[in-house]
């Protein structure tokens, strides 16, 4: 059916399939050192890994994409690992009137799926 | 800033960057011929193409990902081309009580971005 259950066990071996991974990044890495004061370093959760057939399918479209990729790999790309949700992050940054806190809702991934 | 404007012109040449493409698929291709009656064939819009630095960035996370991929390509993958929105689709399918229409909201892509 259009709502086949997405597969949750990785057939490629541990750590190979789409998952959340932490990447350390400094303000310099991000190019933010001129306007962000704090934190000096961010633990950035990102989505990495492969998306084998029906693994963590985001939705019906992803299931179709996986199937058609199997039939026409040159024409249809495999689904890829992207955030399914985000963790809000607070940054302390410079403004014209001083410093202020601002929340960013789409900065750090909280979960991943194959889309 | 965290909200740098995503780039909209493709530096790789026409048709190479993330865009919407139509793929024809039959019910047999999709494995749906046992439960869907109509349509016999679907024009499936899918997201294909590459995501060069800051091209059609979905959000701040995608911009960070693009930047860190430039710094640590082995550790951080490039953003990839996925649907930003969907076109609802109706399918006519068999049920125990007869045939009926059902709308699927996440079946055909309407727009794409790099996430």
């Amino acid at each position: 059916s259009a709502h086949a259950h997405p597969r949750d066990s990785c057939p490629l071996g541990p750590g190979r399939c789409c998952h959340l991974e932490t990447v350390q990044a400094t303000l310099e890495d991000l190019g933010w050192s001129d306007w962000v004061l704090s934190p000096r370093q961010l633990q950035l959760s990102m989505c990495v890994g492969e998306c084998p057939h029906l693994y963590r399918s985001a939705n019906t479209h992803a299931q179709i994409k996986a199937r058609l990729h199997g039939l026409q790999p040159d024409k249809v790309p495999a689904p890829c690992c992207v955030p399914s949700s985000y963790t809000p992050v607070v940054l302390m940054h410079r403004t014209d009137s001083g410093v202020s806190l601002q929340t960013y809702d789409d900065l750090v991934a909280r979960g991943c799926h194959c889309a | 800033s965290a909200h740098a404007h995503p780039r909209d012109s493709c530096p790789l040449g026409p048709g190479r960057c993330c865009h919407l493409e139509t793929v024809q698929a039959t019910l047999e291709d999709l494995g749906w011929s046992d439960w869907v009656l109509s349509p016999r064939q679907l024009q499936l819009s899918m997201c294909v193409g590459e995501c060069p630095h800051l091209y059609r960035s979905a959000n701040t996370h995608a911009q960070i990902k693009a930047r860190l991929h430039g710094l640590q390509p082995d550790k951080v993958p490039a953003p990839c081309c996925v649907p930003s929105s969907y076109t609802p689709v109706v399918l006519m399918h068999r049920t125990d009580s007869g045939v009926s229409l059902q709308t699927y909201d996440d079946l055909v892509a309407r727009g794409c971005h790099c996430a």
Epitope: - | P39, Q43, T87, P88, V89, V90, L91, M92, V99
Partner: antibody, heavy 118, light 112 residues
């Protein structure tokens, strides 16, 4: 719940243009596979397919009447329109609009009656 | 255009007994994909038509299973296994193999 409702002038004189409106709810004409068609039925007689319009703006007109018909849609306001130029007494009928999904015509309006009389 | 032919009236039927309504098309409605593009509608007195049967043999959800349909490429039959008072009306067959979709003239189901 899907509902469709036709509206029209009721009475016209020969050679005038008939303008019909189908107002619908419960579905969207921006959904892939959905269309709206117009069908008419002279009193006590059978059904005749006039025209239909799809979600992607593709249109079909009955060949026998094509030169007189114009179908259009206003997706955001859930309306479909049909114009029939230079009506004649033979156009006296009940006009129905109906929802299409591919080849499935599942929901019809209650119909609006047109009388063409001089 | 494909012509759909129906008798104007059915044989009068008694409530609780079965009824059959026939329809013939001027061209086979069986497509190369295996689907027969034949439909049955019922128009009850003072109402708009309602779809009963989809693609020759598929009952539409919500329609009582007293209704069934069968046929070849050109000859079709709608059967009502136990006729009820609410089944009275005009039954139309229609084709959607080719544009324009065309309807039969309708068969009026009459009770004894």
């Amino acid at each position: 719940q899907v509902t469709l409702k036709e509206s029209g002038p009721g009475i016209l004189q020969p050679s005038q243009t008939l303008s019909l409106t189908c107002s619908f709810s419960g579905f969207s004409l921006s959904t892939y596979g959905i269309g709206v068609g117009w069908i008419r039925q002279p009193s006590g007689k059978g059904l005749e397919w006039l025209a239909h319009i799809w979600w992607n703006d593709n249109k079909y007109y009955n060949t026998a009447l094509k030169s007189r018909l114009t179908i259009s849609k206003d997706t955001s306001n859930n309306q479909v329109f049909l114009k029939i130029a230079s009506v004649d007494t033979a156009d006296t009928a009940t006009y129905y609009c109906a929802r299409l999904a591919y080849d499935y015509v599942d929901s019809w309006g209650q119909g609006t009656t047109l009388t063409v009389s001089s | 255009d494909i012509v759909m032919t129906q008798a104007a009236f059915s044989n009068p039927v008694t409530l609780g007994t079965s009824a059959s309504i026939s329809c013939r098309s001027s061209k086979s409605l069986l497509h190369s994909n295996g689907i027969t593009y034949l439909y049955w509608y019922l128009q009850k007195p003072g109402q708009s038509p309602q779809l009963l049967i989809y693609q020759m043999s598929n009952l539409v959800s919500g329609v009582p299973d007293r209704f069934s349909s069968s046929g070849s490429g050109t000859d079709f039959t709608l059967r009502i296994s136990r006729v009820e008072a609410e089944d009275v009306g005009v039954y139309y067959c229609a084709q959607n193999l080719e544009l324009p979709p065309t309807f039969g003239a309708g068969t009026k189901l009459e009770l004894k």
